[in-house]
Interface confidence: medium
């Protein structure tokens, strides 16, 4: 097929950078992070959307690996679990150095491309991972966090999640609390991408308005195509355009077709819609492979990206637009975030007020002065 051949030609030069893959969660769930378990061999790993041969076949050149700990760890062992998931990403990259190059910058991604390796970055999926601490946030940055999803599917004491918009969560922060605003400023200062997947619309707008740099939605689709509150509404897509930000489309069936069944063409409909409303510069891919139970027909695993690119070419996307969606848009946003960073500026120091800090198993050192 001409378009499939064209897709492969383009992807050899410009492989895909995907915004969100939950393989690290699968490694915890299946093997308790024991990578030396013979069943955990990533060259032969079965039962997952992701393994090394599939990554190669899919022309995956960059991946934000999701460091995720569930919401029920909030105010419990969220930080420990986060550190363990960061550790498993580091160990995975060291164990397969011919495949993965652990990187923390846009320049690192370009280096991985030159070496023919999968640029491997860490995205921390959920603000509860920082336990309402700017010190923990900075420590996670030192350990390689290069995006933070402000919430998962639960509120933090400082930001509201998407379930507020369904009525399943109560709004607490009206988008961002004053401490949440300090988190955003500190992420800007450090040069960490701010990820608005999973957050409420009020949090999306408050953050797009506050951030000194473009932001991303690492795995979200278009609300006008499928009215799931995990997707991005058109008024926010217009803000994405104005701020030169990025929406990386999630492939989960229920966010694509709003039913249990979906197909590749419907994913392309989301990409078309985002391109139409926010512009071609705003489009990317964040498949959420290994993080969702159902994926579209034609996008069964990470090897199938070329088929999606072929469909976009069939729909008259230009080569430049396709290359933007594959990698250039993410690289542009990441570079803008890096340029807006200022590590010489004084860090944010004001802690969250004690009465806003959730959880009952806490000491109060420092607060009682």
């Amino acid at each position: 097929d001409f378009f499939r051949d064209e897709a492969e030609r383009i992807m050899r030069d410009s492989p895909v950078i995907d915004g969100h893959n939950d393989l690290p969660w699968q490694l915890l769930d299946m093997f308790n992070n024991r990578l030396q378990d013979e069943r955990a061999n990533l060259t032969t790993l079965a039962g997952t959307h992701t393994n090394i041969p599939k990554l190669r076949a899919g022309f995956v050149g960059g991946q934000f690996w999701s460091v995720y700990t569930p919401c029920d760890t909030q105010n419990k062992d969220a930080v420990r679990r986060t550190l363990e998931q960061m550790d498993v990403v580091h160990r995975m990259c060291r164990m397969y150095p011919e495949t993965f190059l652990y990187v923390t910058s846009s320049a690192g991604i370009r280096q991985a491309f030159r070496e023919g390796k999968v640029a491997s970055l860490i995205g921390v999926e959920g603000g509860h991972s920082i336990d309402s601490s700017l010190g923990v946030l900075r420590a996670l940055y030192q350990l390689g966090m290069r995006y933070l999803t402000l919430t998962h599917s639960c509120n933090t004491p400082w930001a509201d999640n998407w379930l507020v918009d369904t009525g399943d969560s109560e709004p607490q922060s009206q988008g961002l609390s004053p401490f949440g605003q300090r988190v955003v400023k500190e992420l800007n200062r450090l040069g960490v991408l701010i990820d608005l997947a999973h957050v409420s619309v009020a949090t999306m707008k408050a953050t797009l308005q506050l951030s000194r740099a473009p932001v991303i939605f690492s795995h979200s689709s278009a609300y006008s195509v499928c009215a799931s509150r995990r997707n991005v509404p058109d008024d926010v897509l217009r803000l994405v355009k104005q701020t030169d930000s990025l929406v990386m489309v999630n492939f989960y069936n229920n966010y694509i077709s709003c039913t249990n069944k979906a197909n590749l063409s419907q994913v392309a409909d989301h990409l078309d819609h985002i391109k139409e409303v926010a512009g071609a510069r705003a489009v990317g891919f964040g498949g959420d492979f290994d993080g969702v139970p159902r994926v579209p027909e034609g996008l069964e695993d990470v090897s199938k990206y070329p088929d999606l690119i072929a469909e976009l070419l069939r729909r008259n996307w230009t080569e430049a637009e396709v290359k933007g969606a594959l990698a250039d848009n993410l690289l542009r946003v990441f570079e803008a975030v890096e340029q807006a960073s200022n590590l010489t500026q004084a860090p944010e120091e004001e802690p969250i007020p004690l009465d806003q800090l959730g959880g009952s198993c806490r000491t109060h050192y420092g607060y009682s002065s």
Epitope: G175, L176, Q209, L210, S211, R212, Q242
Partner: nanobody
Framework: EVQLVESGGGLVQPGGSLRLSCATS????????IGWFRQAPGKEREGVSC????????NYADSVKGRFTISSDNAKNTVSLQMNSLRPEDTAVYYC??????????????????????WGQGTQVTVSS
């Protein structure tokens, strides 16, 4: 918490002038925009004018351009709206509001389109002969 108190409203004849002031509680002016909005009876609230904390960005609704001027005095934490050549259709309750918003956003999108999170109680302006 940001507190906003409007003053300066009143009754004025068409063609006359008024100066509205918005006193803000002390807050870090970095990252703020202050806007004036108005709501006439039976109509939706509309943006009139806004200014960034630095004063570097000012926006006006088309209906007031050339007649209204917004200014800020950061030393006194006040934002003023000078309204000249007033018309009967300017009759409304005028509200002062504050938005947490970065210079980056303002440069891309202006301040009238921001999401304003803090609001005053409003002051009545009536233009009538």
């Amino acid at each position: 918490e940001v507190q906003l108190v409007e003053s300066g409203g009143g009754l004025v004849q068409p063609g006359g002038s008024l100066r509205l002031s918005c006193a803000t509680s002390e807050f870090t002016l970095d990252y703020y925009a202050i806007g004036w909005f108005r709501q006439a009876p039976g109509k939706e609230r509309e943006g009139v004018s806004c200014i960034s904390s630095s004063g570097g960005t000012t926006n006006y609704a088309d209906s007031v351009k050339g007649r209204f001027t917004i200014s800020s005095d950061n030393a006194k934490n006040t934002v003023s709206l000078q309204m000249n050549s007033l018309r009967p259709e300017d009759t409304a309750v005028y509200y002062c509001a504050a938005a947490r918003v970065s210079a980056y956003y303002l440069g891309n999108y202006g301040c009238l389109n921001a999401e304003y999170g803090y609001w005053g109680q409003g002051t009545q302006v009536t233009v009538s002969s």
